[in-house]
């Protein structure tokens, strides 16, 4: 007779990342008896929800239920039915919803209310939808990558699980780029964190971590582009904006009302003598870079050193994982290799931005024009942000590792968020006495 396999004693968790440009659903799985061990949780599925971010549903909240259906049904298929009622579901909304809340708390609450009602109709253990803070977003991203890299494990391995992993227990810093915000999080070297808002203290697996984090709202790649356009149109002599961040020959009409819709452009808002303007690409990396630098105020710093806009930033320390849009953009541009120096990246960007739009469209025929048109800006923005914003240098560039996945799990805040909410990161080493919930992160 054939041996029947014993049913797996596993658990599942679902996190929805409600970002500014889209929503993604992640399904995680782990062995039930090992949930306090480090590195046992892994991602089994990612489902990208079709459509924009949830903040765009403010005038059509009745469509939210349908919007979420496909990915929630996918979760129903992937997770065994017997596990449905025990599977927690969390939704975390990030900077897109932070911006909507700044405009109108009532409208943001309306969206979240309908999101919660829609998600509660599935057979899972729904645990709520909320707007996470920028500090949480940075912290959970840092927890995710270090958990996946095995940095919290006390056992020193003789082998590497990923190419860029060093075998020491020094944690990686986390660099996260979204559409509406960007986060920088790392453990500084013996440096006092001069601003309390940027300081986090963790005790994880028996070790204390003093972590620096900051989230720059409006400095995600999409909002940064809106900022740049709002800034540049101020000095345009007519309704044509010759833009170095777009390929030569590229043309696009922008509504002024769309430009000023976001709180991120308020500081540049002015009465213009036209309702629309046309972007005409001229494809010049250097000029694009210069225009982007004007978004960073580096003239004021009340601390020993700053990133930009008067925000404290300690000296950079150790290796960094750069993920989310840092990775997607650099991957598209074929610039994620460890061997590519910062000088080489700059050279490649100069060439890429100078390529005519018609040529670009032919070379990347399968890519949506909306996304394709913005890679020159996004790539230049990433360089500007890392070099001038965060003070990476040609030498320290090699410490930036552009990461999409680590051992099959996406780098990002969602895994860290779930680990925390399910109490799977103990403060002490798991072999000690059972812990009360208060001792967790």
């Amino acid at each position: 007779t054939q041996n029947k396999a014993l049913p797996e004693n596993v658990k599942y968790g679902i996190v929805l990342d409600a970002g500014s440009s889209h929503t993604s659903l992640y399904i995680y799985k782990w062995p039930a008896e090992k949930e306090n061990d480090t590195g046992v949780v892994h991602q089994v599925e990612e489902c990208r929800v079709k459509g924009p971010g949830i903040s765009k549903f403010v005038q059509k909240v009745n469509e939210i239920g349908i919007y979420l259906t496909d990915c929630m049904e996918r979760a129903r298929e992937v997770i065994p039915r017997s596990q449905h009622q025990e599977t927690p579901v969390y939704l975390g909304a990030t900077a897109g919803m932070r911006l909507l809340r700044m405009e109108s708390e009532e409208l943001a609450d309306r969206v979240l209310d309908v999101v919660e009602r829609s998600l509660s109709n599935y057979p899972f253990d729904f645990q709520g939808a909320r707007i996470i803070t920028g500090q949480e977003e940075g912290a959970y991203g840092w927890i995710t990558i270090n958990y996946l890299l095995g940095k919290f494990s006390q056992k020193t391995r003789w082998f590497s699980i990923v190419p860029y992993e060093t075998n020491n227990q020094e944690t990686f810093g986390a660099l996260d780029l979204g559409g509406a915000s960007t986060q920088v999080t790392f453990v500084p070297q013996n440096q006092t964190i001069e601003s309390p808002d940027n300081a986090l203290q963790f005790r994880l697996y028996g070790k204390d971590y003093n972590v620096y984090t900051h989230s720059f709202l409006c400095y995600g790649k999409d909002q940064a582009l809106w900022q740049k356009l709002a800034k540049d149109i101020q000095v345009a002599s007519n309704e044509i904006l010759r833009d170095p961040c777009f390929h030569p020959g590229y043309k696009k009409v922008v509504n002024v009302s769309d430009l000023y819709k976001t709180p991120c452009t308020k500081r540049f808002e002015m009465t213009l003598p036209f309702q629309q303007f046309e972007i005409q690409g001229i494809g010049n990396y250097q000029q694009c870079h210069q225009s982007i630098l004007e978004l960073f105020n580096t003239s004021y710093c009340p601390y020993s050193q700053c990133a930009f806009n008067g925000i404290f930033l300690p000296p950079l320390q150790g290796d960094f994982g750069a993920f989310s849009a840092f990775y997607f953009v650099m991957k598209f541009l074929n610039l994620t290799s460890e061997k590519v120096s910062q000088e080489k990246v700059t050279e490649m960007m100069k060439k890429f931005c100078a390529q005519p739009w018609e040529e670009i469209k032919t070379s990347y025929a399968g890519v949506k024009e909306k996304y394709l048109s913005e890679y020159c800006f996004s790539g230049t923005y990433i360089l500007s942000l890392l070099l001038q914003g965060y003070h990476f240098t040609a030498d320290s560039w090699e410490h930036i590792h552009f990461i999409g996945k680590i051992q099959g799990s996406d780098a990002g805040w969602t895994l860290g968020y779930m680990l925390n909410l399910t109490n799977m990161i103990p403060a002490e080493q798991p072999l000690s006495t059972p812990l009360s919930h208060s001792t967790y992160v």
Epitope: N62, R110, L112, D113, E116, R117
Partner: antibody, heavy 121, light 107 residues
Framework: QVQLVQSGAEVKKPGSSVKASCKAS????????ISWVRQAPGQGLEWMGS????????NYAQKFRGRVTITADESTSTTYMELSSLRSEDTAVYYC??????????????WGQGTMVTVSS | EIVMTQSPATLSVSPGERATLSCRAS??????LAWYQQKPGQAPRLLIY???TRATGIPARFSGSGSGTEFTLTISSLQSEDFAVYYC?????????FGGGTKVEIK
């Protein structure tokens, strides 16, 4: 002052359906959510589901999913709760109640007088 | 779902005395908790929301306290009209859930 007026008592056979109504008067109907809560004789309160009339968005307790349908008619400021495949255990008073707030504020500040539904063969 | 547990099931109190009712949530609900009063043959009435805020028209003798998982409803000096069943309800996470109720009866 908002008032919720519910339809009269019903006697139903097992396996059939019941549709109770809840009409709002004296206030803005659409923007508030309406919950349905039932109470079996001598028992506690049990939430069944909720709807935001303006959006038509309804959500239901797991126990009743597939058997209950909550709808709303904005033109008459009326919410309906239909429960199908009735059994004797569904004998209860069915209340509609207004949720006073929005996101994470689902306190029930105005209640209807209740509709008694008896399921008996 | 969040399970709400009320204690005691029955509380016998003399008029003019203080009554203390407890409600416990199976997980933290912050301060997203309401208390209701129900008299025989009547619909429930909202007394307290946000764990400690009295609803419109509710006398000052009713007070609520607590947050997270432990909550208390206190009636400082029981009047004859206060003898009823009291329910707590969490409204942090769907589904909305009620406690089993505490019957406050005349001693």
């Amino acid at each position: 002052q908002v008032q919720l007026v519910q339809s009269g008592a019903e006697v139903k056979k097992p396996g059939s359906s019941v549709k109770a109504s809840c009409k709002a008067s004296g206030g803005t109907f659409s923007s508030y959510a309406i919950s349905w809560v039932r109470q079996a004789p001598g028992q506690g309160l049990e939430w069944m589901g909720s709807i935001i009339p303006i959006f038509g968005t309804a959500n239901y307790a797991q126990k009743f999913r597939g058997r209950v349908t909550i709808t709303a008619d904005e033109s008459t400021s009326t919410t309906y709760m239909e429960l199908s495949s009735l059994r004797s255990e569904d004998t209860a008073v069915y209340y509609c109640a207004r949720e006073s707030g929005g996101y994470r504020d689902h306190r029930l500040d105005v209640w209807g007088q209740g509709t008694m539904v008896t399921v008996s063969s | 779902e969040i399970v709400m547990t009320q204690s005691p099931a029955t509380l016998s109190v003399s008029p003019g005395e203080r009554a203390t009712l407890s409600c416990r949530a199976s997980q933290s609900v912050g301060s997203n908790l309401a208390w209701y009063q129900q008299k025989p043959g009547q619909a429930p009435r909202l007394l307290i929301y946000g764990a400690s805020t009295r609803a419109t028209g509710i006398p000052a003798r009713f007070s609520g306290s607590g947050s997270g998982t432990e909550f208390t409803l206190t009636i400082s000096s029981l009047q004859s009209e206060d003898f009823a069943v009291y329910y707590c309800q969490q409204y942090l996470i769907w589904p909305l859930t009620f406690g089993g109720g505490t019957k406050v009866e005349i001693k």
